[in-house]
């Protein structure tokens, strides 16, 4: 918030020493020119003394057809050169010229700092004709002046392709100091020096700066704007502002909070989104960052099965997104999971721990000692196997999947059978005679299907052939057995 003090009564010149053609404002006009009622224009006066030769931009009229005599050169009359006034006051200034009546369609335009003032400006041109010349007075008024109205104003008139330009009228709006740079909120390291900058301008100048910390002035003597405050270090949060003083009063900058960087608060709301046999997807809500950006986070995973080792795994991850997929976990196991995040100061405490479980895994080993033989009398294939030594993480065995592929004369057909967990043998009907049947078996848990056993092949002869010799899983390293009858 900007605070403005009461405007001071004493005038304060913009430049040191007297300036010709310049005067403080807020007096009644000395010119008896018509002006819009309600205005109280500032005092205006000519920048040159009476009788002083004029050297401005003039138009030299051509010889008249009547008397072949030269008309005097056209020029704007001298007027006030410098107007000093306070913000929010009204001002009216003008320029005047006497134009011989031989000239028609004369228009006066107003310019500020080299740009024509068009549109919604209070510019009024009044004409006072007599026998030979017309006095033209162009008035320009500004209601409730602002700093942006500061500048050099001129009148221009075009006659016979000649441009007549008046002397400039300098408008100087004075007011309370105006901040061009205010201190900024900062997050700083404890007991570490930092700088704050404050800059304010008039007019009027000079502008002096006082610094304020937690409502108390820091500097006894003011510093001329701009001012840099070096704070040797803070141990706790503080609020700083600066006061800018000039002869019109004082303006106070916004108060800025200087925060002390600290370790972050622990993350909250650690949640489980998805669990598989060997991974858990978690998310969390970051805690307060301690006025310093998060750098990374650490996901801590602790085995909590009643009789686990209790191994602690720590996974480092980026601070964003606030999610992480924990991998390399054991199937069918319980874990306690916590998250901690760090900034430049250090690590937060660990979030509240949450419990999570992985699901059953698929078996990791295939059934053993698979044997296959043909029972020709029943026209089926008898399959036997041994239950695999499944790891407990695979969960409870729910059954077996039997794949049997029938190949004969370029035709190949795969069929799948499911049998219960208590079985260690199965019978499948012969699908094709004079063909090879290839059998593979996999154990199944709720976690999925395990690896298939090595293929065992048996030849199914045409009707009438008899064989009872089994085909079985090879010893490691042997080629797939094929029993041809």
């Amino acid at each position: 918030a900007i605070t403005e003090a009461r405007e001071e009564a004493k005038p304060y010149p913009l430049f040191p020493g007297p300036l010709p053609g310049s005067l403080q404002t807020d007096h009644t006009s000395l010119l008896s020119l018509p002006h819009t009622s309600g205005y109280q224009p500032a005092l205006m006066f000519s920048p040159t003394q009476p009788g002083r030769p004029y050297t401005g931009n003039v138009a030299i009229p051509r010889v008249t057809s009547a008397g072949s005599k030269l008309l005097p050169p056209l020029a704007f009359k001298h007027t006030v050169g410098h107007i000093i006034l306070s913000e929010h006051k009204d001002v009216k200034f003008n320029c005047s010229i006497s134009v011989p009546n031989i000239y028609q369609d004369t228009t006066i335009s107003w310019w500020k700092d080299g740009k024509e003032l068009l549109g919604a400006h209070h510019a009024i041109t009044q004409f006072y004709p007599d026998d030979e010349v017309t006095a033209i007075i162009a008035s320009f008024s500004i209601t409730s002046v602002q700093r942006s109205d500061n500048g050099s104003y001129i009148c221009k008139m075009k006659i016979n392709n000649e441009e007549i330009v008046s002397d400039p009228i300098y408008i100087e709006v004075q007011g309370l100091p105006h901040f061009t740079k205010q201190p900024e909120s900062m997050n700083v390291t404890r007991n570490t020096a930092f700088n704050l900058t404050c800059q304010a301008v008039g007019p009027p100048e000079p502008v002096n700066i006082f610094w304020v910390q937690n409502s108390s002035r820091v500097n006894e003597q003011p510093e001329k704007s701009p001012s840099v405050l070096t704070v040797p270090g803070l141990t706790e949060m503080a609020v700083f502002s600066c006061e800018a003083h000039n002869d019109k009063g004082l303006t106070v900058s916004k108060g800025v909070q200087i925060n002390i960087k600290a370790i972050p608060s622990p993350p909250t709301e650690v949640s489980i989104h998805n669990s598989t046999a060997h991974s858990i997807l978690i998310s969390w809500v970051p805690g307060f960052d301690g006025y310093s950006p998060f750098r990374n986070c650490s996901v801590q995973v602790k085995e909590v099965d009643p009789l686990s080792n209790g191994s602690v795994m720590i996974f480092n991850t980026s601070a964003s997104p606030h999610m992480y997929q924990i991998k390399q976990l054991q199937a069918l196991a319980n874990y306690s999971i916590g998250v901690s995040c760090m900034n430049e100061i250090g690590w937060s405490a660990v979030s509240p721990w949450i419990l999570a479980s992985t699901t059953e895994g698929a078996p990791s080993v295939a059934p053993l000692n698979v044997t296959v033989f043909l029972n020709e009398s029943r026209d089926n294939v008898d399959i036997r196997w041994m239950k695999p030594l499944t790891k407990r993480q695979a969960g409870e065995l729910v059954g077996y999947r039997i794949s049997h592929v029938w190949q004969s004369a370029g035709i190949s057909k795969e069929l799948l059978e499911e049998v219960g967990q208590n079985n260690s043998r199965a019978q499948i009907s012969v699908q094709v005679h004079n063909a090879t049947c290839t059998v593979r078996i996999a154990a199944v848990t709720k976690g999925g299907v395990g690896p298939f056993s090595d293929p065992v092949k048996i030849f199914i002869p045409a009707h009438g052939w008899v064989d009872h010799a089994p085909s079985s899983t090879p010893a490691p390293g042997n080629a797939d057995p094929v029993l041809i009858i």
């Epitope: 602790k302 209790g310 191994s311 602690v312 916590g338 407990r392």
Partner: antibody, heavy 114, light 107 residues
């Protein structure tokens, strides 16, 4: 190699408290649960509870919640079990063991007697 | 709490014999069963974990099997140093509970 060192014996008066120690070495102390078991003379084993030195997380057998307090000192890699309001029923051998109970201390024989 | 029932309470065998010790749980413990040997005046020693997983340094004559609620510890060709009390322990839920033990005596 992994070692769990316990004092051989503690003699305490009934009504008093005792703090049994278990000093660990040969492994990362903060990476394994520390369990405590009780075995009365000629009896079977009872599980008292466990503590995780990483964050002092504890689980107790409800039967021992008012009797035993488990703590750790990470700096010395030592686990402690404090037993309070001792009676003759507390006279037993107390074991510490880690992880899957593959490593056990030698046991501390506690005698509560006046 | 999960109750573990061990049988027999005592087993008397001749060296060289093969023996089977039984442990039955009051509910399914999903193979989270462990076997310990405790010789006289010694700390217990882990023999088998998770029903059938062998432990490094334990003689191969000790094997475990079972699932659900029924578990067995087999000792192939018993040796004199196997005389001890054998405990089963469930690690499925807290509190961890031990069986009452089976005492193996050698004739």
């Amino acid at each position: 190699q992994v070692q769990l060192q316990q004092p051989g014996a503690e003699l305490v008066k009934p009504g008093a408290s005792v703090k049994v120690s278990c000093k660990a070495s040969g492994y990362t102390f903060t990476n394994y649960w520390m369990h405590w078991m009780k075995q009365r003379p000629g009896q079977g084993l009872e599980w008292i509870g466990r503590i995780h030195p990483f964050d002092s997380d504890t689980n107790y057998n409800e039967k021992f919640t008012d009797k035993a307090t488990l703590t750790v000192d990470k700096s010395s890699s030592t686990a402690y079990m404090q037993l309070s309001s001792l009676t003759s029923e507390d006279s037993a051998v107390y074991y510490c063991a880690i992880g899957t109970l593959i490593y056990w201390g030698q046991g501390t024989t506690l005698t509560a007697s006046s | 709490d999960i109750l573990l029932t061990q049988s027999p309470a005592t087993l008397s065998v001749t060296p060289g014999e093969t023996v089977s010790l039984s442990c039955r749980a009051s509910q399914s413990i999903y193979k989270k069963l462990h076997w310990f040997q405790q010789r006289s005046h010694r700390s217990p020693r882990l023999l088998i974990k998770f029903a059938s997983d062998s432990i490094s340094g334990i003689p191969s004559r000790f094997t475990g099997s079972g699932s659900g609620t029924d578990y067995t510890l087999s000792i192939n060709s018993v040796k004199p140093e196997d005389e001890a009390i054998y405990y089963c322990l469930q690690g499925y839920s807290t509190p961890l509970t031990f069986g009452a033990g089976t005492k193996l005596e050698l004739k």
